[in-house]
């Protein structure tokens, strides 16, 4: 799996999970979130060469097409596969609110 | 939806469905498929600017992150959303076989 266990231990130019810490205030302009101040969002990036973690039949076909037609611009792309939620604490006036935000943290990647 | 109805009628630099006809023999080296000789596989390509058909909360966050931090390399990618199968006819000796190959045709795209 193209997850932290594999990608963070290997220098990998191909599609892999990349570390990315997002500070809510500085990076997104969201000043109203009380906790956490930021989180490890991560992201997916890297090349998708022939059969590198292909997600669907179409991405496998596209991968092969690119190998045979290297001048082609049609190639699979490295995107998130497994995502996890993030729980935040904020205030509505003096009232604390806890919200679970779905699909906020990327745990693994794929070529799609 | 970033599908043929929208993308094939509009000149669009952003993430959109692109036409791609794949000839099994010429483009993939698959000489054994009897019918069809090829098919409209299509593919997804184009930029994923702020809020262009963002797929998940993470891709929205990444999109916003990129808007505020334009030097960042972390950006969503244009990939397939809806896929359809393709039915092929091939022969095992003289015996015709019909097979439905899943996820072979891209019908729409998304930024993920």
């Amino acid at each position: 799996a193209l997850d932290a266990a594999y990608c963070f231990r290997n220098v990998q130019d191909n599609c892999c999970l990349r570390p990315l810490y997002i500070d809510f205030k500085r990076d997104l302009g969201w000043k109203w979130i009380h906790e956490p101040k930021g989180y490890n969002a991560n992201f997916c990036a890297g090349a998708c060469p022939y059969l590198w973690s292909s997600d669907t039949q179409h991405s496998r076909v596209l991968s092969l097409y690119n190998t045979i037609n290297p001048e082609a611009s049609a190639s699979p792309c490295c995107v998130s596969q497994d995502l996890e939620p993030l729980t935040i604490l904020y205030y509505i006036g003096k009232t604390p609110k806890i919200e679970q935000l779905s699909n906020m943290i990327v745990k693994s990647c794929k070529c799609s | 939806a970033l599908d043929a109805a929208y993308c094939f009628r509009n000149v669009q630099d952003n993430c959109c469905l692109r036409p791609l006809y794949i000839d099994f023999k010429r483009d993939l080296g698959w000489k054994w498929i009897h019918e069809p000789k090829g098919y409209n596989a299509n593919f997804c390509a184009g930029a994923c600017p702020y809020l262009w058909s963002s797929d998940t909360q993470h891709s929205r966050v990444l999109s916003l992150y990129n808007t505020i931090n334009p030097e960042a390399s972390a950006s969503p990618c244009c990939v397939s959303q809806d896929l359809e199968p393709l039915t092929i006819l091939y022969y095992i000796g003289k015996t015709p076989k019909i097979e439905q190959l899943s996820n072979m045709i891209v019908k729409s795209c998304k930024c993920s």
Epitope: L28, G29, W30, K31, W32, Y90, Y91, I92, G93, K94, T95, K97, E99, L101 | Y50, L51, Q57, R60, V61, L64, T67, I68
Partner: antibody, heavy 121, light 107 residues
Framework: EVQLVQSGAEVKKPGASVKVSCKTS????????MNWVRQAPGAGLDWMGQ????????NYNEMFEGRVTLTADTSTSTAYMELSSLRAGDIAVYYC??????????????WGQGTLVTVSS | DIVMTQTPPSLSVSPRETASISCRAS??????????MHWYLQKPGQSPQLLIY???NLESGVSDRFSGSGSGTDFTLRISRVEANDTGVYYC?????????FGQGTK
């Protein structure tokens, strides 16, 4: 230039629903909370609720709870307010107003031009 | 809910004079070192516009003839050298507690 442009005046029958839109431009829609405020003829301002467009998180004034629904379309940077079970007391100008940005519940620094909703049988 | 009471309900001021509007909250709107009180002006036929943020901070683009003061439950908006263009209804607003609430307005 920050702009909030609301949909036009509506005339509705009692018991019906109305949906008012607020198309924004000139700022990053996903960065700010969007509030809705109503003003009955010759009266003051009543805060109805708010939405954070990035996630669709909402916070409603209990006075309107159950009758008002706030939504947002991030692809078009448009916020919506739907009010159901309309009655004569809902005749008012409805405003969308952008939150200042420092707190979830905050002052409002940009306002739409307002949408007059009339309820009449 | 916090109730905001403005006085006077209406006010007539001659040009170049100073106008003062008071706003009293039913309970303190101070938290974390801030006073969560704001002032707006709604000119005839227009939408409200923010004048003062957090009790005393002048909003960008607003004339420095407007000033705000106060803390806890008692707040004041002052308009010096009043002009005809200042005509309208002035509202105070608190966001210290949910639901956010406005005063009834001073004309």
């Amino acid at each position: 230039e920050v702009q909030l442009v609301q949909s036009g005046a509506e005339v509705k029958k009692p018991g019906a629903s109305v949906k008012v839109s607020c198309k924004t431009s000139g700022y990053i829609f996903m960065k700010y909370w969007m509030n809705w405020v109503r003003q009955a003829p010759g009266a003051g301002l009543d805060w109805m609720g708010q939405i954070f467009p990035a996630w669709g998180m909402t916070n409603y004034n209990e006075m309107f709870e159950g009758r008002v629904t706030l939504t947002a379309d991030t692809s078009t940077s448009t916020a919506y307010m739907e009010l159901s079970s309309l009655r004569a007391g809902d005749i008012a100008v409805y405003y969308c107003a952008r939150g200042y940005g420092n707190y979830a519940l905050d002052a409002m620094d940009y306002w739409g031009q307002g949408t007059l909703v009339t309820v009449s049988s | 809910d916090i109730v905001m009471t403005q006085t006077p309900p209406s006010l007539s001021v001659s040009p170049r004079e100073t106008a003062s509007i008071s706003c009293r909250a039913s309970e303190s709107v101070d938290s974390y070192g801030n006073s969560f009180m704001h002032w707006y002006l709604q000119k005839p036929g227009q939408s409200p516009q923010l004048l003062i943020y957090l009790a005393s901070n002048l909003e960008s683009g607003v004339s420095d003839r407007f000033s705000g003061s106060g803390s806890g439950t008692d707040f004041t908006l002052r308009i010096s050298r009043v002009e005809a263009n200042d005509t309208g209804v002035y509202y105070c607003q608190q966001n210290d507690e949910d639901p956010l609430s406005f005063g009834q307005g001073t004309k």
